[in-house]
């Protein structure tokens, strides 16, 4: 018969052959041949596999370093990563949680809408037009432009979201 | 290497009052928000106060407010927190922290305590 060209799902081609995937927790030792299965090992403690596979070596489960702020949230198993999660107060940098911080900060053109909590983070928002902020923060909301009639100047330079407006002085030369 | 270093905490009196100092090294302190957080005895941390870059902008929590006064000196890299007529309840270890506020640049913290 003609070697295959594919392969059904969980398994795959190799020296012309389909051979069976390693079911997750478990990685390939050795590709099945003509007369033998696919020889797959479980992987050892703290280490994972989540998918079938034909990987050689297992993947480490990710370490929650307290130094970092991190602790485990959920323990990894033999087809699972560990979880982790900051400390109490302490608030992920990102979904995969590889730091904490004490809060983020809103980036100039956003303000605070909502101060952070021990279980919420900051909320920023977009400064609406007629408001701006040019700091990075954690407090501070958006801030109004400035009204130069009231001044008696006028708008030299326009605001921003990042920006105040410029005053400057009324243009006194009229007809 | 970023390093916050607070002092200034005692044992004080009902009433009584304290000032935390938080001496920054490690990089340029002017133009970085600053907060001081409290965690006391088995609780969370709780954000007391926080002061702009500039310093021409604070915040106080409503616990604090009127009763507790953040400043900063950008030419002795130092951040401080006045605390008046303190109450038992605000007995806890204080922290400072920075923008970006990771973990890993918090300083030790000074343990207040408040009782007669």
């Known amino acids: 018969p003609e070697p295959p060209t594919a392969c059904r799902e969980k398994q795959y081609l190799i020296n012309s052959q389909c051979c069976s995937l390693c079911q997750p927790g478990q990685k390939l030792v050795s590709d099945c041949t003509e007369f033998t299965e696919t020889e797959c090992l479980p992987c050892g403690e703290s280490e994972f596999l989540d998918t079938w596979n034909r990987e050689t070596h297992c993947h480490q489960h990710k370490y929650c370093d307290p130094n970092l702020g991190l602790r485990v949230q959920q323990k990894g198993t033999s087809e699972t990563d560990t979880i982790c999660t900051c400390e109490e107060g302490w608030h992920c940098t990102s979904e995969a949680c590889e730091s904490c911080v004490l809060h983020r900060s809103c980036s100039p053109g956003f303000g605070v809408k909502q101060i952070a909590t021990g279980v919420s983070d900051t909320i920023c928002e977009p400064c609406p037009v007629g408001f701006f902020s040019n700091v990075s923060s954690a407090f501070e909301k958006c801030h109004p432009w400035t009204s130069c009639e009231t001044k008696d100047l006028v708008v030299q330079q326009a605001g921003t979201n990042k920006t105040d407006v410029v005053c400057g002085p009324q243009d006194r030369l009229r007809a | 290497e970023v390093q916050l270093l607070e002092s200034g905490g005692g044992l004080v009196q009902p009433g009584g009052s304290l000032r935390l100092s938080c001496a920054a090294s490690?990089?340029?302190?002017?133009?970085?928000?600053m907060w001081w957080v409290r965690q006391a005895p088995g609780k969370g941390l709780e954000r007391v106060s926080a002061i702009s870059g500039s310093g021409g902008s604070t915040y106080y929590a409503d616990s604090v407010k009127g009763r507790f006064t953040i400043s900063r000196d950008d030419s002795k890299n130092t951040l401080y927190l006045q605390m008046n007529s303190l109450r038992a309840e605000d007995t806890a270890v204080y922290y400072c922290a920075k923008e970006p506020y990771s973990f890993d640049h918090r300083g030790q913290g000074t343990l207040v305590t408040v009782s007669s």
């Open positions: 490690g990089y340029t302190f002017a133009g970085y928000e």
